[in-house]
């Protein structure tokens, strides 16, 4: 039994997968912030989690996926105001009773120390200092991401 949040997440991911391949992104678009091999867009309006997910999709991006603790810290270092919360692409899967990223993978329990309950209609937000479980209907800001395409160095023969 999938929750409405899970269905929304799956639908958006599937529609993203159906879109035609685009040329790789070599530089971050204006207004996007480069963080290593990603471009991040921090919203300045608020939305519930599923609307945030949809908004990122319209920008040909996704809600932020965080690979590990190191990436979390680097992302949090960009957040200036301690009081502001941002949705990321992680929510509670009722059917699998686990935290699930919007790309279908499950949270490695060592990656994020989540404050709050793991239960139905819970989604994950980050602040400058912490990671929180919030009701997915809560209206807060969000972070979209685009992956940068790695540029392979060309090797030229000696001239």
């Amino acid at each position: 039994q999938k929750s409405s949040i899970e269905k929304c997440s799956v639908d958006i991911q599937q529609s993203r997968n159906k879109t035609t391949e685009r040329p790789g992104l070599l530089n971050c678009p204006i207004y996007w912030q480069q963080l290593r091999e990603k471009c991040l867009l921090f919203s300045h309006t608020v939305n519930p989690w599923n609307n945030s997910l949809a908004d990122c999709s319209t920008k040909e991006s996704s809600l932020l996926l965080i690979r590990d603790k190191d990436e979390l810290i680097h992302t949090q270092n960009l957040i200036r105001d301690k009081a502001i919360l941002f949705w990321i692409g992680l929510n509670f899967s009722l059917s699998e009773k686990n935290w699930k990223w919007i790309n279908g993978s499950f949270l490695n329990s060592n990656d994020l120390e989540i404050r709050g309950d793991a239960k139905e209609n819970s989604c994950i937000s980050i602040s400058q200092t912490s990671v929180y479980s919030e009701y997915c209907s809560t209206e807060i800001r969000w972070i979209c991401q685009k992956e940068l395409t790695p540029v392979r160095n060309k090797v030229y023969p000696d001239s």
């Epitope: 207004y31 912030q33 867009l41 921090f42 919203s43 908004d55 957040i79 200036r80 105001d81």
Partner: antibody
Framework: QVQLQESGPGLVKPSETLSLTCTVS????????WTWIRQPPGKGLEWIGY???????NYNPSLKSRVTISLDTSKNHFSLRLSSVTAADTAVYYC???????????????WGQGTLVTVSS | EIVLTQSPGTLSLSPGERATLSCRAS???????LAWYQQKPGQAPRLLIY???SRATGIPDRFSGSGSGTDFTLTISRLEPEDFAVYNC?????????FGQGTRLEIK
């Protein structure tokens, strides 16, 4: 509604640092992109750069080595510093709110009224 | 950087006439990323049009914007005395943000 007001010295000596502040009233600085633009007398507009409310910046490459834009959320203002100025930096300096990318690109609105900075010894 | 070229440099018309101002980009600009501003002597620019064709709040409907790719147009359907000013286009689709050199609209 949101209003912006530039302040700072109107005269700066060559090789010194130009410092201006833009005070935001009628709204919070903790959203949007906050921009500086300048206009030399009788010439066109030149974008200097912006700071986002989270503190990240983007500068015009032609000025990048000399410019710093900073933000003070507690005072609801943002600032411009331009180092090693010359006569070519004489201009009216404007601050403006940039709607950035929130689904639509909103453009620069509103603007401050502008302040003339003359670089001369 | 994207260079915006506005034409004509000066446009001389009478009140009641139609004004057509052009802005040409050196490379393609998404229509979402083009704006027009009006500037009167001694004043800050005022946003007229964003997203190439959307009127900003409080802008009369005699102002309209159109275009895509590299060619954009600002049209003022019937000139009022207060419309005589300098008009600037601006692109904000790629960094650095750039402005055109301006078109001066003067009374004939």
């Amino acid at each position: 509604q949101v209003q912006l007001q530039e302040s700072g010295p109107g005269l700066v000596k060559p090789s010194e640092t130009l410092s201006l502040t833009c005070t935001v009233s009628g709204g919070s600085i903790s959203s949007n992109y906050w921009t500086w633009i300048r206009q030399p007398p009788g010439k066109g507009l030149e974008w200097i750069g912006y700071i986002y409310y989270i503190g990240t910046t983007n500068y015009n490459p032609s000025l990048k080595s000399r410019v710093t834009i900073s933000l003070d959320t507690s005072k609801n203002h943002f600032s411009l510093r331009l180092s090693s100025v010359t006569a070519a930096d004489t201009a009216v300096y404007y601050c403006a709110r940039d709607g950035g990318y929130s689904g639509t690109y909103w453009g620069l609105d509103p603007w401050g009224q502008g302040t003339l900075v003359t670089v001369s010894s | 950087e994207i260079v915006l070229t506005q034409s004509p440099g000066t446009l001389s018309l009478s009140p009641g006439e139609r004004a057509t101002l052009s802005c040409r980009a050196s490379q393609s600009v998404s229509s979402s990323h083009l704006a027009w501003y009006q500037q009167k002597p001694g004043q800050a620019p005022r946003l007229l049009i964003y997203g190439a064709s959307s009127r900003a709040t409080g802008i009369p409907d005699r102002f309209s914007g159109s275009g895509s790719g590299t060619d954009f147009t600002l049209t003022i359907s019937r000139l009022e005395p207060e419309d005589f000013a300098v008009y600037n286009c601006q692109q904000y689709g790629s960094s650095p943000i750039t402005f055109g050199q301006g078109t001066r609209l003067e009374i004939k």
